[in-house]
Amino acid sequence: APTSSSTKETQEQLDQLLLDLQVLLKGVNDYKNSKLSRMLTFKFYMPKKVTELKHLQCLEEELKPLEEVLNLAQGKNSHGGNTRESISNINVTVLKLKGSETFMCEYDETVTIVEFLNRWITFCQSIISASSS
């Protein structure tokens, strides 16, 4: 059974993941329309369902494409460091949260970068609210 300390640690990690995803989404939405419309040409893969921590494997698999798109959009922009930091944070947090169990992602739809970040934000929020109730 999970101890209160491990539950607390998971909660903190989910809070951190949520924060980093929100930082990325804010960055995307802050781009002037000229950049955003071009970013929307890229597609990201979402699994059939995201309800458990092990499903974070599917987020991990999309982090490299996500970083590439954000870097392409930024070009020589000074925000590049923030993106790399957020992606790195997400990578570390996801590795801690998803556990060692191997999970095969079944992707069933492609979405834009905005939808992708919003869906994973919603996932974090739902897990956080479920574990705090």
């Epitope: 040409t41 597609k43 392409l72 834009t112």
Partner: antibody, heavy 117, light 108 residues
């Protein structure tokens, strides 16, 4: 109603200069890319490039770089495509189109340009 | 330079289903868009982001994607669907490109 209205048919001689226009209405012209597309007689669509009217950021297809110039005057919601020296091979229909959510959702009616040698 | 490959022509009888494919190396990571162009008219967007249909486009038009190939499907084909169909996408460096186009002929 959201629309793009293009200037009329042009008949020119090789070596002439030309500037055709595309006027947007019914939406915030500044904040959407305007693309230009060429269609030679009996042929397919070719993407020439695109301009963002708010700051005139411009991207050209490698095939058209240096051959044409794209510009925009956001004060009158109009984008332009111009040639310094026309060739017979520039004979084509030219379309402007609005780029929204990464697709060209609104198209002008086209401007036919005929260049005689 | 980046290319999108389409069949030159597809022929179907009214009421049948037409499928037009478009292949390109970047399509696993870049959305595709489909345009219909009837003779003497400007192109019209019929599918965007692989599968989405703009308002005003009949439900008979649908899009799908698998790996490096996207497909435009027109079910219960009507005489008015007789047109050229172009796929469009962007390469990895964000330069846009159209396929060469597919002429859909509705027989009869």
């Amino acid at each position: 109603e959201v629309q793009l209205v293009q200037s009329g048919t042009e008949v020119k001689k090789a070596g002439d200069s030309l500037k055709i226009s595309c006027k947007g209405s019914g939406y915030n012209f500044d904040t959407y890319w305007i693309g230009w597309v060429r269609q030679m007689p009996g042929r397919g669509l070719e993407w020439m490039g695109t301009i963002y009217p708010a700051d005139s950021d411009t991207r050209y297809s490698p095939s058209f770089q240096g051959q044409v110039t794209m510009s925009a005057d956001k004060s009158i919601s109009t984008a332009y495509l111009q040639w310094g020296s026309l060739r017979a091979s520039d004979t084509a229909m030219y379309y402007c189109a609005r780029f929204s959510s990464s697709a060209y959702d609104i198209w002008g009616q086209g401007t036919m340009v005929t260049v005689s040698s | 330079s980046y290319e999108l490959t389409q069949p030159p022509s597809v022929s179907v009888s009214p009421g049948q289903t037409a499928r037009i494919t478009c292949s390109g190396d970047a399509l696993p990571r870049k959305f595709a868009y489909w345009y219909q162009q009837k003779s003497g008219q400007a192109p019209v967007l019929v599918i965007y982001q692989d599968t989405k249909r703009p308002s005003g486009i009949p439900e008979r038009f649908s899009g799908s994607s698998s790996g490096t190939t996207v497909t435009l499907t027109i079910s219960d084909v009507q005489a008015e669907d007789d047109a050229d169909y172009y796929c469009q996408s962007a390469d990895r460096s964000d330069s846009y490109v159209f396929g060469a186009g597919t002429k859909l002929t509705v027989l009869g």
